[in-house]
């Protein structure tokens, strides 16, 4: 995502189609308060950021309210009046959906249905990963609504679950970010557990997009 302009690297994250975060890393200007100027319409004047992110006392990014703006962000990072990086980008390329909310588990013998609140926009995948202490890696199942049924579980085993949301690659492109994971929830015999006690250190989840 970054650019080569004067050695400025940028990162854009569009949180849940609500807030855009643009951060920069400019070694040449590491002790400088660069300013961030932006607009959502190519015909408007630039506004200056009012919500800077700071790193070691210097500006390193900007948070923008961009709710219901699914198109273009025009921006300029400046050292005084001198632009050091200028770009215009489709924001949805950098979508990061919000983490699943109101995650619920409904058990029926050897199957569980995991549900959560669907986000207000579409073309998303809701992924549930789960494992028992006897599994060497996480198993995964995903659906395009937050209603995921996993069958063939062993009622006697303790299972850990967590859920996340991903933007469909065919729609949003391959450079989006998956949501943060929901909290891990542990279940055994249809009842919630504090932990799966006999679980060894869990392996890292598959980072499939």
């Amino acid at each position: 995502q970054g650019g080569a302009a004067e050695g400025v690297q940028i990162q854009i994250i569009y949180f849940n189609l609500e807030t855009v975060q643009v951060t920069w890393n400019a070694s040449k200007y590491s002790r400088t308060n660069l300013t961030f100027h932006y607009r959502f319409n190519g015909d408007e004047a630039y506004d200056q950021c009012t919500n800077y992110l700071l790193q070691e006392g210097h500006t390193s990014g900007c948070l923008l309210d961009a709710e219901q703006r699914d198109d273009i962000l025009y921006f300029s990072i400046r050292n005084g009046t001198h632009p050091v990086f200028t770009a215009s980008r489709w924001m949805v390329y950098y979508l990061k959906p919000s983490s699943p909310k109101h995650v619920r588990f409904s058990w029926h013998q050897d199957a569980v249905t995991v549900t959560c609140s669907d986000l207000s926009y579409g073309d998303l995948l809701y992924e549930v990963q789960y494992r028992s202490p006897f599994d060497t890696e996480w198993q995964s199942k995903q659906e395009n609504t937050c209603n995921v049924t996993i069958e063939g579980l062993d009622a006697e085993k303790c299972y850990s679950f967590w859920v996340r949301v991903k933007a469909m690659e065919d729609v949003y492109g391959p450079d989006t970010y998956p949501s943060d994971w929901s909290e891990v929830t542990c279940w055994q015999r249809g009842e919630i557990r504090d932990a799966c006690a006999e679980t060894p250190t869990p392996p890292k989840p598959k980072l499939s997009k």
Partner: antibody, heavy 122, light 107 residues
Framework: QVQLVESGGGLVKPGGSLRLSCAAS??????????WTWIRQFPGKGLEWMGY???????YYNPALKSRITISRDNAKNSLYLQMNSLRAEDTAVYYC??????????????WGQGTLVTVSS | EIVLTQSPDFQSVTPKEKVTITCRAS??????LHWYQQKPDQSPKLLIK???RSISGVPSRFSGSGSGTDFTLTINSLEAEDAATYYC?????????FGQGTKLEIK
């Protein structure tokens, strides 16, 4: 399978206007998730994106051309249009209409018409 | 706007050769880079999307790679019908832009 056929090209005098049409068949231009674009190719073979119109009628234009072009559509005729004003010699090009990949205005162009040649000359 | 620079501008190759065309972007664009083939007197045809994703109906000898600012289109075992001009295009930057093209001639 979508088919796109452009028409309306020809010889135009400098300062004049043109209106190009693009008739789509085999696919509705109002299908959700698709954007339609005009792209031109200069005699030297360089390609320039001109603008989009979406399934929702939203338009985006190349800033370099924004003051001179308008993209519109007629749903009943399943057709797109490009209106271009104040033409100059450097607007001489083959004009293509094309469809974006599903997902909208952000992507590559997977279906193209055969193009229509516009020559601007006195 | 994001400038895409292709190299070489022109290449003359013999059938069955392996051909590599590069495209460099003036700003990083992740993997949102697409490749087109245009044969004489035809319109461009999408070959590869998102740097390396294949397109249905395109021969498997065409492949793409790269991310960030540097991208490559590779044609393995070139065939006579591959004589064409090849263009790269970026999509996250506005406006979308194309490379200047690489003309491939078959000896």
């Amino acid at each position: 399978q979508v088919q796109l056929v452009e028409s309306g090209g020809g010889l135009v005098k400098p300062g004049g206007s043109l209106r190009l049409s693009c008739a789509a068949s085999g696919f509705s231009i109002t299908t959700s998730g698709y954007y339609w674009t005009w792209i031109r190719q200069f005699p030297g073979k360089g390609l320039e994106w001109m603008g989009y119109i979406g399934y929702n009628s939203k338009t985006y234009y190349n800033p370099a051309l924004k003051s001179r072009i308008t993209i519109s559509r007629d749903n009943a005729k399943n057709s797109l249009y490009l209106q271009m004003n104040s033409l100059r010699a450097e607007d001489t090009a083959v004009y293509y209409c094309a469809r974006s990949l599903y997902g909208g205005y952000k992507d590559a162009f997977d279906s193209w018409g055969q193009g229509t040649l516009v020559t601007v000359s006195s | 706007e994001i400038v895409l620079t292709q190299s070489p501008d022109f290449q003359s190759v013999t059938p069955k050769e392996k051909v590599t065309i590069t495209c460099r972007a003036s700003q990083s664009i992740g993997t949102s880079l697409h490749w087109y083939q245009q044969k004489p007197d035809q319109s461009p045809k999408l070959l590869i999307k998102f740097a390396s994703r294949s397109i249905s109906g395109v021969p498997s000898r065409f492949s793409g790679s790269g991310s960030g600012t540097d991208f490559t289109l590779t044609i393995n075992s070139l065939e006579a019908e591959d004589a064409a001009t090849y263009y790269c295009q970026q999509s996250p930057g506005f406006p979308p832009t194309f490379g200047q093209g690489t003309k491939l001639e078959i000896k």
